[in-house]
Every structure is written in C-alpha cells, then in structure tokens.
C-alpha cells in the first residue's frame, strides 16, 4: 500500500529515533564530564557533538547558562540543568501539545510528529480536511481542530456511512402544512395553497390574499376569497381593459347614423312635456291663425301644437292619439275634441295645415282636409288694443290635465319647413341652427335610442296577489329586450331598491366574464353583484337580438336569440339570490331601462349606460318611454337612427 | 324677401299738402297692418298709427288726429302717409313698418321738409 | 298712455366699456318690452323683442332684462359699430310709446 509522503515519513521517523538512542546517551555522559564538570571551550563542545550544527547551537546558550548560573566550579546545580537541557531541543517541547504526537531531538534541531488533522513545523496547524473533494462529505464538510466531520443540509438526513445524505419527507408528518396542501421537495417542503390564498406558517393554514392591497386595480377593487375583481366608472363610460385591471373608454362598436338635419325641429326633446318652441304673436290688426309644416313619427301619442291665449279662455291643441291627429279645442269655456284622418305615424313626413277661417278651423294631411270644426270666435285675442296669440310647439303651456282630454303630451316626432302665420321665421331657424339637441336623426328607424348617456325609469309592481284570497303573493319578472346595440357594455334593464340604494336585479352587456377573467362578449344576468347566467352575444354585428329573462320563484333563466344561457350558481345559491330578489320586490322598486342612478360600481356587474336601440316588454307589457316616471331627454323614446351602411 | 320701399324726400310750403308712399313686397300684404312713425331732425320716435290692411280703417295717437290720413291700393301692395296743411312742426323723416305687434321691418324712411 | 322714461339720454364710452340703458314705465307692462338701435340716416334695428329675446342675427354681447316697469338693455364690451341712438318700445298697450332715446358716442 502506498502512503502519501508525509504520512510515510511520520511513520518512518520513530523508527530512526531508536538508532540515535545509544548515542544520545553516550554524548551526554561525554557533555557532563567535558562542560558540566569543567568549564569547556567551543573545541572541547565540537569534540562533544562531533558536528558544528550542534556546536552552533549549544556553545551561545552554554555561555548563557554560566552568565546565569556562574562557572561549572561554583557547583550550582541549576547550572548543571541548565547545561544538561541544552542539547535536547525538545526540553523543553516546543512542539504544539494538541497537535504533536512526539518530538524529536534533531543535531541543532527538533522534530514535531503530528497527530493525524494537525500539520505545521510544530503541529499547531489544523488541516483542513474540507479543502480537498469536501472531506468526501456528499452535502457538508464541517473542519474541526484536528478533524472533520460531515453534515447535511436541512431537510436531509446523514446516512449511516457518515457521508452521504438522504432526503427527509417532511409531508409525512400530517401536521406539517396543516390545512394546506404539503408537497415534498429535495430537502425541503412546500405548504401550497389554491390561487388567490397564501400559507401562513404561523396559523398553519390558507388565507386570502387581499389583492386590493397591491393597488392592482385602476379603479376600484372588491377583494374575495382567493381572487378580486376590478370594477370601472361604468356610468363615467369606462370598462375594464384586456388586463382586468386598467379602464378604458366604452367606445361605439357600431357606427349608427346619427347626423342630424339642421333644418328640423325635434318635438321630444322636453321630458317634462313642456314646449319645445314658444312663440307670440301679436298683431293691431286681427289675424287669423295659419301653420304649416312637415311632420315624421313613430309616435303614437303627444301634442304637436297649442294656439291661443291662457288655459280658461280660447285655445286649440293638435295632437296624436292611437297614430291619428286629434284637435281639442276650448271656445269661451266650452271643451270639445275631435279626431279623425288617417294614422300618420308611420315614420314618414307628411305636411299638416292648421287654418283658422271665418267660422271654421281646417286641419289638413298632404293638402287635404281630414278635419273641418264649426267654431264660434277667434284664436287672437284682444287685449288693451293689441291682438295676441301664444303657439308653442311639442307641448302646451299649461298642465296636461287641463286638456279637454287628458293626454300624454311628449311626442317623438319631426318638424320641418314650418310656416307660422305665414311669416318668415328665422329666430327659431337660427335657435335650432345652433342647438343640436333641437335638431331631429336625418333618418330614424321604429325603436327607442339610447344614447349611452343616460337612463329612463318607472314605477312598476312585480308581485301579483292570486285571486283566492289568503294565499300568498306570487312574485314574476319576465322581460323581452330587443336590442340593436351600439357598444358592449351597458345596462338593458335593472331594478332600484332607492332606499337600500340596492340593484336587486340588472340584465346588462358585458365584454367580460369576471370569475374566469376572460374577455368574452356576454350578457349577464344577476341579482345585486351576483352573476346568475351568462349567455354569450354576437352584439357588434349591428343584428337586432332578442333578450330574454324569466325570473319566478324557484327558476331564472336568460336566453339570447332562443338559446338559453350558462347557470353560474349552484341550485342553493340561485334559491337564496331569488330569495334576495322577493325580499327586494315587496318593498318599493323602480325598474330602469338603459342604466341605473349613480350607485356604487359594485352595486351590480355593469353600471354603464346602454347605447344603442331597443324596445323593453316587462311582464307581457310593452314599456313605452313617453310613459316613464322619467327619461334622459338624449333617450328617443319612438325613434332609433339606422346602422350606417358599410363603405364601398 | 320683405322689402318697404318709400317715396322720395320733399321740400314743402307751409300750408301745403304731401303724401309719401311705402310700397310693400315678399309678403301678404293683406295679412299684416301698416304702421307710421315720426321722427323730429335730432329727435325721438314717435308712434302715429297704423291702418288695417284687410279693411283699411285707420287709427291715429290723439296727437296726429286732423291733418293725417292713412290710406291703402291694395292692388299695388301700398300704403300712404298724406299730411295736409303742413306746418314747420311737421318737418320729419316719416317711416312706415309693418305690424307684428313690434316693429321688425321698416321703410328706408321719407323726409319731408316744411319751409317758407 | 304708458309713458317710458329712458336714461341716459347720452353717453360717451369707450371701445370695450360695459354701457347700460334703463327705461323705466308709467305701468306695469309684463315683459313686453322691445329694444331698437338706430344710426343715422337709417330706419332702427330690432335688437330685442318682447320677453328678452335677442333677434335672429343680433350679436350675444347684447342682452336685456326686466319685467314690470324697470327694463334694461346691456352692451357687454361696445364695439366700433354699436355707436349709435338705442330706443325702448313697449308693446303692450295702444299707444305703442318709445323712450326718448340714449345716445352712445365715443370718448
């Protein structure tokens, strides 16, 4: 077997020692009688050690031990000593005591043998074992004075042979994650929770991460276990961005025709009803009423036109009724109202005449007379020398109820070449000009338009009381949505609880599935912020589709052109969300069409304006605009503008 | 285009006679009265009337009762301003402007000067 | 016969001055109040008509308020071309009566 030199030589040298021995002894009776005894000179020391190394060495330190201890002669025994231990260079040992084995005295020198671990002239140096292929250790090699040992890392175990490791499975111990899920790993472990939670080693368990934290949304942010969704100023005219998490501009996803024609007059644009031009003449000499114009409709009911002086005196009102002109008239107290001619709401222009003759008022359709009254006075009316009249157009002057016969006088309707008294009018001409809100869509289409701008609402009631008394009321919500969409987000139809300031029900377009964080083109039908069913849309294809929702104790469901869509709840989940929605529907509600008031976005899935046309049919009744408790005056309640044509 | 276009300016004696016209075009003449204002050189304007196209009856302000006729050719779409026995008081630009209850279309007006 | 008392009767501004024009009536005549303007040489303008309406063409830096018997008409910043004589007409009752007028010079 072959050894490394040093270990061949620590293993040689005992050995060598041995030969010396009768040597050492023999110089050192020579030594006693030469230079203990007398006193010796460099000569007599060379002849002791035969050798000058030795001689070198001895013959300083000998003359220091007579200056110490005075000459051989004065008999002192620490001379004696001191001599005697001079040739011997390992008394006293100048070797490392932990480190040495033996030390040999050498001829002017010493040797340290060292203890394996222990290197250096006098064995005070460790050897690091660990400098050379890790001590042989596989993971770690720890160097101690004198030796090494091996270790391993945490999550390892030191096998048997003292040098390799093993893994430890910490996941065999079930207390290890808690409730979460251990996966073993090379010498460690991970506690894994789902997405959207993370593991906290002090409770040994999975929480939430509230991902509102991390400012990730633009807007606001609704943190829920293991996710969190953004939500955008809907009514501002945001949606969420392709990322989830940034707004952007709901824009128009379909170019529809909404050039106006600055020489029309459009009748609805006053909500409340009031006139939408109010002009008086007055004249010195007498005059009798004449007016002219071209008029367009869908409308079936509202007023076109007032002439006369205040509420209790003379006046006339031309109106729609059921989509046929209809003249109510007050002469001197007396209240009459006729109707006849042809339904004229057909959405296409039409000149209509109003003259006031001798005896007679005479309202034409295209030029011929569809009415001729018998009246018994006239329209202007004297007054301090001066003859007055009041005509305002798309509304009356005074309260509806006031009429002859109640009606409902908001009229979606179009004027143009109007002629007043046969005068030239330019200060409406000029007013409208400037006010494109007066100004009527070149070219509409049967519908209702919304804008994307606001909202109309009414005063509805979804419970129905059966007719055998005691029983308990039922409760239906049953809407068919015909839409033509112009963007893909808005609301189609939502209920209001004003005094929860809660949406207990919404039916909305949404280009996003907000669980799967999927852009998708939906509609969404839910209950407050909960989803119910999802159904996917085709809405930017300018294409008219039917929305349909059912909603009855014990079943919802939403079809979009027939085909029914996708449940997001479980049947628990849906009965306690329908149970939400009684509770709401036996207090008051307002039902809302086109958006909802400003409610917090996260009220419901979509707080965004519709934009776009549609007519609303709620519990088998068709929802006509000019009925609602109120309407965005932008809301065209019996017109819609075409989808622009495609461009060659 | 609604145009009243008046007779020229004239110089007259004291004691004469004058009648200026205002013709009227681009509307029904019948349909709407003529009125006639005053104005003194450096002065306001003063109303003086106005006459009923349809029946050519005339009202004048107590001020310009007497001397002041205002008379009608329907025929030719005019109106006439005849002043007799004219005074110095009487030198004016007299325009006529058609009835609305306020006037919004005038005459380029008529001066009419009374001097000895 | 409803008089009207028109104030000043002249006033020397400057270009961009704020002038304003009171008249103030005998009666109460509602709303019916008419502002003219009149340069010389030329029949007056309409520039208001009865309800503080500003006549097709009028430029917005004229305005008017009032109702009953203090009515008044504003130039906002006078411009180079609204030196002229202003009138005041009611028109709601026979006698029609103009106010004596309010001269607009340069300073």
């Known amino acids: 077997a072959l050894l490394p030199a040093r270990e061949a030589t620590q293993f040689l040298r005992p050995r060598q020692r041995r030969a010396f021995q009768v040597f050492e002894e023999a110089k050192q009776g020579h030594l006693e009688r030469e230079c203990v005894e007398e006193l010796c000179s460099r000569e007599e020391a060379r002849e002791v050690f035969e050798n000058d190394p030795e001689t070198d060495y001895f013959y300083p330190r000998y003359l220091d031990c007579i200056n110490k201890y005075g000459s051989p002669y004065t008999k002192n025994s620490g001379f004696a000593t001191c001599v005697q231990n001079l040739p011997d260079q390992c008394t006293p040992n100048p070797c490392d005591r932990k480190g040495t084995q033996a030390c040999q005295d050498l001829m002017g020198n010493f040797f340290c043998l060292c203890k394996a671990g222990w290197g250096g002239r006098l064995c005070d140096k460790d050897v690091n074992e660990c400098s050379q292929e890790n001590g042989g250790c596989l993971q770690i090699c720890h160097n101690k004075p004198g030796s090494f040992h091996c270790s391993c890392h945490s999550g390892f175990e030191l096998s048997s042979d003292g040098r390799t490791c093993q893994d430890i499975d910490e996941c065999a111990d079930s207390e290890a994650c808690g409730e979460a899920r251990c996966k073993n790993l090379p010498g460690s472990y991970s506690c894994l929770c789902d997405e959207g939670f993370a593991y906290s080693s002090q409770e040994k368990a999975c929480r939430d991460v509230d991902e509102c934290l991390q400012g990730r949304c633009e807007q606001v942010c609704v943190n829920s276990p293991g996710s969190y969704t953004c939500h955008c100023d809907g009514r501002g005219g945001l949606k969420l961005s392709q990322d989830m998490d940034t707004c952007e501009d709901i824009l128009p996803c379909v170019p529809f025709s909404v050039a106006k024609s600055v020489k029309s007059l459009y009748l609805g644009r006053m909500f409340s009803g009031t006139p939408v031009i109010r002009l008086r003449f007055k004249r010195l000499q007498p005059t009798r009423l004449v007016a002219e114009f071209d008029f367009r409709t869908f409308d079936p009911e509202g007023i076109l036109l007032f002439a006369g002086g205040h509420q209790d005196s003379t006046w006339i009102v031309l109106a729609l009724r059921a989509g046929r002109l209809e003249l109510q008239l007050r002469y001197n107290g007396v209240g009459r109202v006729t109707s006849s001619g042809p339904v004229i709401n057909h959405g296409m222009w039409q000149t209509i005449s109003v003259e006031e003759l001798a005896r007679n008022l005479v309202i034409k359709v295209n030029r011929d007379a569809v009415m001729k009254i018998a009246v018994a006075g006239d329209l202007f009316q004297p007054e301090r020398g001066l003859y007055h009249l009041n005509l305002t157009v798309g509304g009356i002057p005074f309260h509806e109820k006031d009429l002859v016969q109640p009606i409902n006088p908001r009229l979606d309707g179009c004027m143009r070449s109007w002629n007043w008294l046969n005068g030239e009018d330019t200060t409406i001409q000029e007013t409208v000009k400037v006010n494109t809100r007066m100004q009527c869509f070149s070219v509409t289409e049967r519908g209702s338009f919304y804008p994307g701008s606001g909202f109309a609402f009414y005063s509805l009631d979804y419970m129905r009381t059966p007719l055998d008394v005691g029983t308990e009321s039922t409760w239906e919500v049953e809407v068919v949505a015909h839409i033509r969409p112009a963007a893909d987000t808005g609301v189609l139809f939502a209920l209001w609880a004003p005094d929860l300031r809660a949406v207990p029900l919404s039916v909305a377009l949404v280009d996003y599935h907000s669980t799967k964080k999927l852009k998708k083109q939906l509609v969404v039908l839910a209950v407050e912020h909960t989803a119910l069913a999802l159904m996917e849309i085709k809405v930017c294809d300018g294409q008219e589709h039917v929305v349909t929702v059912s909603l009855r104790d014990g079943e919802a469901t939403l079809e979009v052109d027939g085909t029914r869509g996708q449940s997001e709840v479980s049947a628990a989940q849906l009965q306690e969300r329908l149970a939400v929605l009684e509770r709401h529907l036996r207090s008051p509600v307002l039902t809302f069409a086109g958006g909802l008031p400003d409610v917090p976005v996260t009220s419901a899935p979509v707080t965004a304006f519709y934009r776009g046309c549609m007519t609303l049919e709620v519990n088998r009744r068709l929802l006509d605009l000019d009925e609602a408790a109120y309407k965005h005056s932008d809301i065209t309640a019996h017109s819609c503008p075409p989808v622009e044509p495609a461009a060659a | 285009q609604i145009h009243l276009v008046q007779s020229g300016p004239e110089l007259k004696k004291p004691g004469a006679s004058v009648k200026i016209s205002c013709k009227a075009s681009g509307y029904t003449f019948t349909n709407y009265g003529m009125n006639w204002v005053k104005q003194a050189p450096g002065q306001g304007l003063k109303w003086m009337g106005w006459i009923n196209t349809n029946t050519g009856e005339p009202t004048y302000t107590e001020e310009f009762k007497g001397r002041f006729v205002f008379s009608l050719d329907t025929s030719v779409t005019t109106a006439y301003l005849q002043i007799s026995t004219l005074k110095a008081e009487d030198t004016a630009t007299y325009f006529c402007?058609?009835?609305?209850?306020?006037?919004?279309?005038w005459g380029q007006g008529t001066l009419i000067t009374v001097s000895s | 016969e409803t008089t009207l008392t028109q104030s000043p009767s002249s006033l020397s501004v400057s270009t961009g001055d704020r002038v304003t024009i009171t008249c103030i009536t005998s009666t109460d005549i509602d709303d019916d109040m008419n502002w003219y303007q009149q340069k010389p040489g030329k029949p007056p303008k309409l520039l208001i008509s009865e309800g503080n309406t500003l006549r097709p063409g009028v430029p917005s830096r004229f305005s008017s308020s009032g109702s009953g018997t203090d009515f008044t008409l504003t130039i906002s910043s006078t411009q180079p071309e609204d030196f002229a004589d202003y009138y005041c007409l009611q028109t709601d009752s026979v006698p029609l009566t103009f106010g004596q007028g309010t001269k607009v010079e340069i300073k």
């Open positions: 402007a058609r009835d609305e209850g306020w006037f919004v279309y």
